[in-house]
Interface confidence: low
């Protein structure tokens, strides 16, 4: 790819990306920022992917230029056009696929100079778990469910009262393939739970870590859940 802009003698500019993860089937964002320019017409943004011949996305002279876009990204990319002038070159990627994983380059040219930065983009599936009391069971049982995970995660139970306890002998985890034959539903059951305790169901793969907590007392049940993407780092 040859870019015919007279850029000799220009300074390099700072471009910053943040490694991130995409949830397959949903929209994702590849984050990239740069030193802003005064004129939108002087800014060129190119997104490239390692191993892909065509461009992922190009934005120049204030609009998208998609004549050299690779087929695998056709109709799935957009920049935040209203934010380019303030230095935001982030790319929105529609309907994230497993094959979108890889190394991307955010390449910027402005009147001040040029610069680029790489980012690692992981793809998989991750979702918030919900923990509920299973009233259908014969003994006090908790059921932790999360609808979409890939690759297959590990599931670990923990308890506030019995910190450090190993619950593998009193729990059972199953993975059920979803209809698209990639992601899986995670179901984990914990038996012999006690009242006045807080239990945590922790689901983790190499992309995300999620925790579903349930606090069971005689008078009420409280729940919370939290999802954290792993290995996000700026470059």
């Amino acid at each position: 790819l040859i870019i015919g802009f007279g850029i000799s003698g220009r300074h390099s500019i700072t471009v910053t990306t943040v490694a991130s993860a995409g949830n397959i089937g949903e929209d994702g964002i590849l984050s990239c920022t740069f030193e802003p320019d005064i004129k939108l017409s002087d800014i060129v943004i190119q997104w490239l992917k390692e191993g892909v011949l065509g461009l992922v996305h190009e934005f120049k002279e204030g609009k998208d230029e998609l004549s050299e876009q690779d087929e695998m990204f056709r109709g799935r990319t957009a920049v935040f056009a209203d934010q380019v002038i303030v230095g935001n070159a982030s790319l929105r990627l529609k309907n994230v696929q497993l094959t979108d994983a890889g190394t991307y380059k955010c390449y910027i040219i402005t009147s001040k100079g040029k610069g680029n930065a790489n980012l690692e983009y992981k793809t998989g599936a991750f979702s918030m778990p919900e923990v509920n009391v299973d009233y259908n069971a014969s003994s006090e049982t908790l059921r932790c469910e999360a609808p979409r995970w890939f690759p297959q995660p590990t599931v670990v139970w923990a308890s506030q009262v019995d910190q450090g306890a190993n619950f593998s002998e009193v729990s059972n985890t199953s993975f059920e393939l979803n209809s698209e034959n990639v992601t899986m539903k995670v179901v984990s059951v914990l038996y012999n739970v006690t009242i006045n305790n807080t239990y945590s169901c922790m689901i983790e793969n190499d992309i995300a870590k999620a925790t579903g907590d349930i606090k069971v007392t005689e008078s009420e049940i409280k729940r919370r859940s939290h999802l954290q993407l792993l290995n996000s780092k700026a470059s």
């Epitope: 929209d27 964002i29 409280k222 999802l227 954290q228």
Partner: antibody
């Protein structure tokens, strides 16, 4: 009514260690994340880190190597230590309570402590 | 980390007008973990909205929040004199917890 009251040194020299403490009056120390947030003069808010009643801490990666947050649950207090300060650490430092059971928001804040780092 | 970009940076309006403040996340945030705060000079921030759209205790109904995924909005239906302040969005769907850069709502 929950109140957070904070104190600590307001003037430091570069390379010194910032130390602030926040006391929690009213309400339980459990079920919450006890947090430190800072705001440089005229700028936005930056999360420093948090601790819960069982001592689990989470820190902002940008400050992790210099930050220690600890708690004394018997006194309903938690503290912040930030080592090797520079002028860039000059800010108003707030302690705050994050409710993780209900709304994942900071409902209660300390009054703020202006910490100035100057030689 | 999730970067929250707020725009506009400054909003110049008159009392009685409608204010629309935007917060865009660099990746999807569960609405459970998106909050809005108001801060006046010399004061600590005050929570207005949590869970993207639920008003905190004691917050007037002229404040409303909406949005999901990467785009969130705080709307003040009719600005009162006491509403002129700086507004921040905040997320904790992913660690580290992050705040937006803020939008200043000033009197025109």
């Amino acid at each position: 009514q929950v109140q957070l009251q904070q104190w600590g040194a307001g003037l430091l020299k570069p390379s010194e260690t910032l130390s602030l403490t926040c006391a929690v009056y009213g309400g339980s120390f459990s079920d919450y994340f006890w947090t430190w947030i800072r705001q440089p003069p005229g700028k936005g808010l930056e999360w420093i880190g948090e601790i819960n009643h069982s001592g689990t801490t989470n820190y902002n990666p940008s400050l992790k190597s210099r930050v220690t947050i600890s708690a004394d649950t018997s006194k309903n207090q938690f503290s912040l230590r930030l080592s090797s300060v520079t002028a860039a650490d000059t800010a108003v430092y707030y302690c705050a309570r994050l409710s993780s059971w209900s709304n994942w928001a900071f409902e209660y804040w300390g009054q703020g402590t202006l910490v100035t780092v100057s030689s | 980390e999730i970067v929250l970009t707020q725009f506009p940076g400054t909003l110049s309006l008159s009392p009685g007008e409608r204010a629309t403040l935007s917060c865009r996340a660099s990746q999807s945030v569960s609405s459970t973990y998106l909050a809005w705060y108001q801060q006046k000079p010399g004061q600590a921030p005050r929570v207005l909205i949590y869970g993207a759209s639920r008003r905190a205790t004691g917050i007037p109904d002229r404040f409303s929040g909406s949005g999901s995924g990467t785009d969130f909005t705080l709307t003040i239906s009719r600005l009162e004199p006491e509403d002129f302040a700086v507004y921040y969005c905040q997320q904790y769907g992913s660690s580290p917890l992050t705040f937006g850069g803020g939008t200043k709502v000033e009197i025109k």
